[in-house]
């Protein structure tokens, strides 16, 4: 008789991240009798939802449903009918959610509440909407690249299955930044994590980690963007903003109220004599990184030593993964190389921001204008934010790893919450038997 | 941790109604699943009806489908349980139970890690 292939024993998950600027679902399997191996679990597709952020549809929250049905009727697509009931749904908001709630609780509420109103008609098996802490954030995204990169397997491997393996079993440290927030996260080396808001203890198949993490409210690039506007409007003279974050020959019209809807310009709002100014970019790499220094505030620290703000950071060690808006942007500058120094990013950078707007447009035809006009800001604040914030330096620049997936998965917070919700990091090492019971058939 | 407090207990007579209270503090009340259970003398404890955290999800045991509701109210971080026509074997104590990020569904198989209230009697009798 022929043997009959058996059906394979899979399960799967779903997790929704909205983050300030979209929400993405990612669609996650494994093999059921495997649940609490490492690196078992993979994500098989990820989709974009179109349009902006869940926070910013609290004036029309009707909208919602038809928001997420593509990506949801996706999800349906993808997992096999029979699995329908089974598979978990998540959905995360992070940042653009954290500063809604500190305008309105009420508010955010009411987007979560049409969000559960929204996911709870569809076939799968619904298990909350929350607003993550930055802390969660860093965790789960440090959680994610380990568990892909393979650092919590005991097993060691003579050969490498996964890119910027080791073959130790030392952690990646975690750098993720999102529109709205940016999060480090990792293992300081022997070093007492003085603060204790930033601590966390892990154990994690059997081994305990004390990792350090932070997340910095309002630092991701498009909110980083409105404070550098909001601080140096204040000093213009007239309602034209002579901005070197932005290529010469860009203009742009920026409405006032819209700078002042964010708490994170708060700190900078001040009565101005227009209720809109033009933004004029004169592209100046050096003269924009002085600018988005002033952001940072580093005369203050009481500890040994700061990020910024006053925030404790422990020295750097070992090796780290840059992801999420790290790696898109430094993707589409092309320096995402091993092999490209600091100082190469920096001259690249340079150049890129002297291009004429004209000539940036001519040669990246394809991209919406929105995002290609700030590609010279986010990059100059990609190498302030690591260079100043975190204190990288030319030497140490050669252990980040500007990563976008690992073995197919995307870097991100939403796999390594997935894995914690769904109870698939076992605090133990599980007891491996020779043979589990599904190899014989 | 978050911790649950019942409220509204008491002796009816068949046919009759009560509504239970159960009262959350600490935590993200809107990040939990809310649930009661009851467990009659002699017997396991056994799921009654369970609410997902913005209330557009319920489950409800085939033994009192159209004469219990589950409501929430996450001003208050309160959950009820409203008991009509009630029969001489709805006596039970009834617990509140809290579950987070977790579904209705879920909390219905007793899934997941799930958080407890002290109980409170209901007994049934004429």
């Known amino acids: 008789t022929q043997n009959k292939a058996l059906p394979e024993n899979v399960k799967y998950g779903i997790v929704l991240d909205a983050g300030s600027s979209h929400t993405s679902l990612y669609i996650y399997k494994w093999p059921a009798e495997k649940e609490n191996d490492t690196g078992v679990v993979h994500q098989v597709e990820e989709c974009r939802v179109k349009g902006p952020g869940i926070s910013k549809f609290v004036q029309k929250v009707n909208e919602i449903g038809i928001y997420l049905t593509d990506c949801m009727e996706r999800a349906r697509e993808v997992i096999p009918r029979s699995q329908h009931q089974e598979t978990p749904v998540y959905l995360g908001a992070t940042a653009g959610m954290r500063l809604l709630r500190m305008e309105s609780e009420e508010l955010a509420d009411r987007v979560l509440d049409v969000v559960e109103r929204s996911l709870s008609n569809y076939p799968f098996d619904f298990q909350g909407a929350r607003i993550i802490t930055g802390q969660e954030e860093g965790a789960y995204g440090w959680i994610t690249i380990n568990y892909l990169l393979g650092k919590f397997s005991q097993k060691t491997r003579w050969f490498s299955i996964v890119p910027y393996e080791t073959n130790n079993q030392e952690t990646f440290g975690a750098l993720d930044l999102g529109g709205a927030s940016t999060q480090v996260t990792f293992v300081p080396q022997n070093q007492t994590i003085e603060s204790p808001d930033n601590a966390l203890q892990f154990r994690l198949y059997g081994k305990d980690y004390n990792v350090y993490t932070h997340s910095f409210l309002c630092y991701g690039k498009d909110q980083a963007l409105w404070q550098k506007l909001a601080k140096d409007i204040q000093v213009a003279s007239n309602e034209i903003l002579r901005d070197p974050c932005f290529h010469p020959g860009y203009k742009k019209v920026v409405n006032v109220s819209d700078l002042y809807k964010t708490p994170c310009t708060k700190r900078f709002e001040m009565t101005l004599p227009f209720q809109q100014f033009e933004i004029q970019g004169i592209g100046n790499y050096q003269q924009c990184h002085q600018s988005i220094l002033e952001l940072f505030n580093t005369s203050y620290c009481p500890y040994s030593q700061c990020a910024f703000n006053g925030i404790f950071l422990p020295p750097l060690q070992g090796d780290f993964g840059a992801f999420s808006a790290f790696y898109f942007v430094m993707k589409f500058l092309n320096l995402t190389s091993e092999k490209v120094s600091q100082e190469k990013v920096t001259e690249m950078m340079k150049k890129f921001c002297a291009q004429p707007w004209e000539e940036i447009k001519t040669s990246y035809a394809g991209v919406k204008e929105k995002y290609l006009s700030e590609y010279c800001f986010s990059g100059t604040y990609i190498l302030s934010l690591l260079l100043q914030g975190y204190h990288f330096t030319a030497d140490s620049w050669e252990h980040i790893h500007f990563i976008g997936k690992i073995q197919g998965s995307d870097a991100g917070w939403t796999l390594g919450y997935m894995l914690n919700l769904t109870n698939m990091i076992p605090a133990e090492q599980p007891l491996s038997t020779p043979l589990s019971h599904s190899t014989y058939v | 941790e978050v911790q649950l407090l019942e409220s509204g207990g008491g002796l009816v007579q068949p046919g009759g109604s009560l509504r239970l209270s159960c009262t959350v503090s600490?935590?993200?009340?809107?990040?939990?699943?809310m649930g009661w259970f009851r467990q009659a003398p002699g017997q396991e404890r056994d799921f009654v009806t369970a609410i997902s955290g913005f209330g557009h999800i319920t489950h409800y045991a085939d033994s009192v489908k159209g004469r219990f509701t589950i409501s929430r109210d996450n001003s208050k971080n309160t959950v009820y349980l409203q008991m009509n026509s009630l029969k001489p074997e709805d006596t039970a104590v009834y617990y509140c139970a809290a579950a987070w990020q977790t579904s209705p569904r879920r909390m219905m198989q007793m899934a997941g890690s799930i958080t407890w209230g002290q109980g409170t009697q209901v007994t049934v009798s004429s």
């Open positions: 600490r935590g993200t009340f809107s990040e939990y699943s």
